[in-house]
């Protein structure tokens, strides 16, 4: 059979039928259903939701839906011994205590099992000492404190505001600075947008609201006790002392009412500049310690959380491909939430549910995709991307041979201004072409394409008339597929206007106030942005699974490789004397990029001309496209980060959420002027240039004519 016969209807009609079947009202209904009680990883409630989703996906028409369980390290507060922070006087009496829970939102007062705010995987401890305010606790903040201000954090408890970077990086930085405890808080400057009311009257964070979250530094390892291998029934588990990525000092999050009480007494050094000041009515003094009258008072942390090996459940649904069943396109998003998960993750899970329903409807009418589509509802994402990583570890041999693409589906919205896409360059053209075919949901863009509104509101900084598409970083379930396995990946959601809203993420992120009502009242009453995200995510999956030639353009990789080579060369050139002394040349890298560009161009020409009716040649060309992302994987991984194996992209060593290009070279160059052995440091730069140049050249050769 020809590929079109096998899939029954013409490709264009298939896509239209699939998109037309997606309904905003269904997404709304699913979101409501998924958000009425908490679904914390490792709990009975989340297991029940897994079984419900399994049952519904079967009803929707998938060929099979299975639960995949793992026993992984999770972290919970002690129910009888709550976590809190005190100010103590010289006699050790507690004269102020932070709140033990968030005031529940209206209508949820009687809901049980709302986990109080905590920093997951914090060790137990009751450190006491002077406070030091460390701004966002970024690498550059500690440089400012230690190098410029000569403030020593050793033996101090540091207080840092949330935002800018992943919280785990903050904790790592504090540990390296010698701190004995970390207090994380949400400053209104970052989590309270001007002119908007706090929940329940608006979408801003109230003073008693607190952001939960894990504070691990896993670097892609998955379950801390079984790095590299699935946490199955016969797993060998490391001892807790050898576990990957656990913090070594107590950590606890608080809201801005409680933060005010701690920060208002701060003495010591004034903030170095205005970028260290938030919006509270406090001086933002750095410390150490409290001012004058309060100088004998100290801060004490009381942390009693426990780490426990707990069973988690992924739901894996399969829609078998008609022509290439051994080629997998994966749509995955997590199911576990910190509390109700109104945005994170259920706004994404509801969209996945509707996408599954639409695919199932087409399948019931006799259609099948060309390639197999796998749908995943991941567990324990909030505890370190554990469900997705364990499943990928268990199935790594299949995935590395058969994985075409992974599309992530966490929160569908973090605002309602415009589209946001992060993906491999291989998917740029797919995203452009798809968004040109979709209608914009934005006010003022009636009858215009999504591409047009997106490009207008979020223009590319490099190419006029094109929208911004960002690098993939981490902090979500695509990590193992892209950074470890080299499977082409992408993600899409609706976002805020970054120009006018400088707060980090969305204000109610990971708080008890992330409810169904938050979405329905304030973010997307008509669920039109959710529907658009469903069309983008679903449309990408459809095209990846159904187009005869994979919708990847290798020429777009060539363009970004040149851009990234220029960027890293320019960073290195900040040290011209050392480059000359140590004979550092980027010639091999530029040469490899030039070769890649030429070979990619020739491959694209052959792709236009080859005989698509010859299934062997078609499969050969598609395999070259599928395996291109894989060719950027270095089996040895990045220095000290063995599970980050992609040579072109990795999560930033200073912020897990951000992507860094040529990360090996970048890290070798970072702060190189402070290295004690410059010869060794510049030797490592040269080694990383060699690795990058070799990898780009090797990837280019996978696109050459095979014989």
């Amino acid at each position: 059979k020809s590929s079109n016969e096998a899939t029954n209807i013409t490709p264009k009609h298939n896509m239209k039928a699939f998109l037309d079947e997606l309904k905003a009202e269904n997404i709304k209904k699913f979101l409501y259903n998924f958000t009425q009680i908490p679904h914390l990883a490792g709990t009975e409630q989340n297991f029940q939701l897994a079984k419900q989703i399994q049952s519904q996906w079967k009803e929707f028409g998938l060929d099979s839906v299975e639960l995949a369980h793992y026993d992984v390290l999770l972290s919970y507060p002690n129910k009888t011994h709550p976590n809190y922070i005190s100010i103590i006087n010289e006699d050790g009496n507690e004269i102020f205590n932070t709140s033990l829970f968030e005031p529940p939102p209206p209508g949820y007062e009687n809901v049980s099992d709302i986990v109080p705010p905590f920093s997951a995987f914090s060790p137990q401890g009751m450190p006491e000492g002077d406070l030091v305010y460390v701004n966002y606790a970024r690498t550059e903040d500690f440089f400012k404190l230690e190098r410029d201000m000569k403030i020593n954090c050793s033996g101090k408890i540091v207080i840092a505001r949330y935002g800018k970077v992943f919280r785990g990086n903050k904790v790592k930085n504090a540990q390296l600075a010698g701190a004995k405890g970390v207090i994380l808080y949400s400053d209104p400057a970052d989590y309270f947008a001007p002119g908007v009311k706090s929940y329940p009257d608006g979408w801003n964070l109230p003073g008693g609201g607190v952001q939960r979250g894990n504070i691990l530094n896993l670097n892609g390892a998955g379950d801390p006790l079984t790095p590299g291998y699935p946490a199955n029934e016969y797993a060998y588990r490391r001892g807790i002392a050898e576990a990957v990525g656990l913090p070594s000092i107590p950590v606890h999050p608080i809201g801005y009412y409680d933060a005010q009480k701690l920060l208002e007494k701060m003495g010591g050094s004034a903030p170095p500049d205005s970028s260290w000041r938030g919006s509270l009515k406090v001086p933002y003094n750095v410390g150490p310690g409290f001012t004058g009258n309060f100088s004998t008072q100290k801060v004490k942390m009381h942390i009693h959380s426990t780490n426990e090996v707990t069973r988690i459940y992924n739901v894996i649904g399969t829609l078998r491909g008609a022509v290439e069943p051994d080629r997998y396109v994966i749509l995955g998003g997590h199911r576990d939430s910190w509390v109700f998960g109104g945005i994170d993750p259920q706004s994404g899970a509801a969209v996945v549910h509707e996408i599954v329903r639409s695919f199932g409807t087409l399948k019931k009418e006799g259609w099948r995709p060309r390639r197999t589509i796998l749908f995943a509802s991941w567990d324990a994402e909030e505890f370190g991307l554990l469900g997705s990583t364990e499943w990928a570890e268990e199935n790594s041999r299949l995935l590395q041979e058969r994985g075409v693409a992974y599309i992530n589906a966490d929160s569908s919205i973090e605002g309602n201004y415009t589209l946001r896409v992060d993906c491999t360059p291989l998917m740029y053209s797919l995203v452009h072409n798809l968004t040109k075919e979709l209608k914009s949901p934005d006010e003022g863009f009636e009858g215009k394409s999504l591409y047009e509104s997106w490009t207008k509101k979020s223009p590319s900084p490099e190419f006029s008339g094109m929208p911004r598409i960002s690098k993939l970083g981490s902090g979500n379930d695509f990590e193992v597929f892209f950074q470890r396995l080299g499977i082409a990946s992408g993600r899409a959601r609706y976002t805020k206007n970054w120009e006018t809203n400088k707060f980090s993420g969305y204000p109610l992120y990971h708080s008890v106030y992330e409810t169904y009502e938050l979405v329905e009242k304030f973010y997307d009453p008509m669920f039109k942005y959710h529907l658009t995200v469903a069309q983008v995510r679903g449309g990408m999956v459809f095209e990846l699974a159904n187009s005869i030639v994979l919708p990847f353009d290798c020429r777009d990789y060539a363009v970004v490789l040149r851009k990234y080579a220029d960027k890293i060369y320019s960073i290195s050139m900040k040290h011209p004397q050392e480059m000359k002394t140590y004979s550092v040349s980027f010639d091999s890298l530029f040469s490899a990029v030039k070769n890649f560009t030429e070979i990619a161009s020739k491959f694209s020409e052959r792709l236009q001309d080859f005989d698509k009716s010859n299934p062997i040649v078609l499969r050969m060309m598609n395999d070259q496209l599928m395996f291109l992302e894989r060719a950027f994987i270095d089996p040895l991984g990045l220095p000290d980060r063995p599970f980050y194996r992609h040579v072109i992209y990795a999560p930033s060593s200073h912020n897990k959420y951000a992507g860094e290009s040529f990360p090996g070279i970048y890290d070798a160059l970072f702060d190189i002027e402070s290295k004690v052995d410059p010869s060794k440091a510049w030797g490592e730069v040269k080694r990383q240039i060699y690795v990058a140049a070799f990898t780009v050249q090797a990837a280019a050769e996978t696109l050459s004519e095979v014989a």
Partner: nanobody, 120 residues
């Protein structure tokens, strides 16, 4: 023998744009083996690379100056130019144009330099 010569005003007012031109003689600017760059040395400080350009007009800029720098090339005149906008006193320095091997920091020829003072 290759020679490079900087030209341009020695005094620039704060917030204005510094403009310098480098004329290359004794050799062609149109070589793919070399980049043409600008470097500077503020009084009492180390050498700082500003940016470079190749004969085709492809530019590389110091990330910390990128938003303010423009380097352009005119192969017909065997010249390349530097523009640095929104200058402050911190931009006071001796500015040199130089040639370096492509993809390296091997500066083999440079002009004698011109002092540019930023002051009102």
């Amino acid at each position: 023998q290759l020679q490079l010569q900087e030209s341009g005003p020695g005094l620039v007012k704060p917030s204005e744009t510094l403009s310098l031109t480098c004329t290359v003689s004794g050799g062609s600017i149109s070589s793919s083996s070399y980049y043409w760059g600008w470097i500077r040395q503020p009084p009492g400080k180390g050498l700082e690379w500003i940016g470079s350009i190749d004969y085709s007009g492809y530019t590389y800029y110091n990330p910390s100056l990128k938003s303010r720098v423009t380097i352009s090339v005119d192969t017909s005149k065997n010249q390349f130019s530097l523009k640095l906008s929104s200058v402050t006193a911190a931009d006071t320095a001796v500015y040199n144009c130089a040639r370096h091997k492509a993809a390296t920091a091997d500066f083999d020829y440079r002009g004698q330099g011109t002092l540019v003072t930023v002051s009102s």
